[in-house]
């Protein structure tokens, strides 16, 4: 039994880091493998993660962490029974994938303006809370070419757009994702999408 693709890990910078790897053949990850992880600190404990299958030869493990600070560094040991298959380390702050925003809502009752709001996925005491920026994706269910991205570079989790920038009388969907420049993170997953029917009063033409 050998590791074909070494574990790569990302952290949500709150409580979970996710590590993925591939074995050289079909593997029952949960029965055959264990990933041990330990904070590099005099008084830390080793923790065991039981991996799940992620495709035939792929494995994924969700490492639970109390909290994360930028200096944290973890040792990782991948075991198959008594055999050490791989040894490495992981610094969560250098491999951050933020949590996806939630509760995306489209408010259509503001006159001729669409207000999109969502929730910051972090609590106020988390470092990322004040460092997230967002991308909002809006697309038409009827027209695949009607697909747009709005970059929200301010901290407030909301976006206002004129309803008239979208076509009237058709359904749209929106979703949002987050990233943090301070840690050069990857983008989060997209939030669940939300749907609304776009309608607005066309302005009277002046002759």
């Amino acid at each position: 039994m050998k590791v074909l693709q070494e574990p790569t890990c990302v952290s949500d910078y709150m409580s979970i880091s996710t590590c993925e790897w591939k074995m050289n053949g079909p593997t029952n990850c949960s029965t055959e493998l264990r990933l041990l992880y330990q904070l590099v600190f005099l008084l830390s404990e080793a923790h065991t993660c039981i991996p799940e299958n992620n495709g035939g030869a792929g494995c994924v493990c969700h490492l639970l962490m109390d909290d994360v600070v930028s200096a944290d560094n973890y040792t990782l040991d991948l075991w198959a029974g008594q055999q050490l298959l791989w040894k490495g380390s992981f610094k969560p702050s250098e491999h951050v994938k933020p949590r996806a925003p939630g509760n995306l809502t489209v408010h259509t009752n503001v006159s001729d303006t669409l207000l999109l709001t969502w929730s910051n996925p972090y609590p106020p005491d988390n470092y990322l809370y004040n460092h997230l920026t967002y991308a909002v994706n809006i697309w038409s269910e009827n027209d695949p070419a009607d697909f747009r991205i709005y970059n929200v570079t301010y901290l407030e989790p909301s976006l206002r757009i004129a309803a008239s920038t979208l076509k009237s009388g058709i359904s749209y969907r929106a979703r949002v994702r987050a990233w943090a420049q301070c840690y050069n993170t990857t983008w989060s997953e997209w939030s669940p999408s939300t749907k609304w029917h776009n309608s607005y009063r066309e302005p009277f033409e002046q002759h």
């Epitope: 904070l39 008084l43 404990e45 600070v69 200096a71």
Partner: antibody, heavy 121, light 110 residues
Amino acid sequence: EVQLLESGGGLVQPGGSLRLSCAASGFTFSDYAMSWVRQAPGKGLEWVSAISSGGSSIYYADSVKGRFTISRDNSKNTLHLQMNSLRAEDTAVYYCARGPQRSATAVFDYWGQGTLVTVSS
Amino acid sequence: QSVLTQPPSASGTPGQRVTISCSGSSSNIGNNNVSWYQQLPGTAPKLLIYANSKRPSGVPDRFSGSKSGTSASLAISGLRSEDEADYYCGSWDDSLSAYVFGGGTKLTVL
């Protein structure tokens, strides 16, 4: 409310032994590293010993190494310090404290009221 | 001799602002966070400031902490008689693999 309550201090002769205990409540004891910090009369604070949340990792200051033994019973939410071959310079108030959890943000966030250990003939 | 250096004493009159310094090195304060502890006469130490400048709930905002390079300081504004106590700084030391304290500063409110 987090509470740490030390017991077991007293007067002991040089070369003697004493066992300190610290009863913890108000938090999940098994999630935290725990420490003993002492303060000699009129002096400053000294980190004496510590034990990781599960008991697998232990620290001793050079001044007590080989004489003191720290242990914990997570089922009873209790921390212990067995002190052997006591010397006059071990005379101090011994505090039980919660932490530290990691190096970069190391802190003792809760302290007990302390128990006085006097080593004298 | 303590690893972290504090002035042995400081004083001020009620309402005044006083500052207590804590000097270390790259292996402790330079690389790790600083905490401050208050020890009122005859009582156990209590956490006053952690992560250089954060206050635990219940600690008045008259107390503030800061860090620059290998030094840290504790500032107390609007000094009160009940602030008379010993104040200790503390930090992890990477070289010693140990938590180290300053020698303590006795604050007198005149």
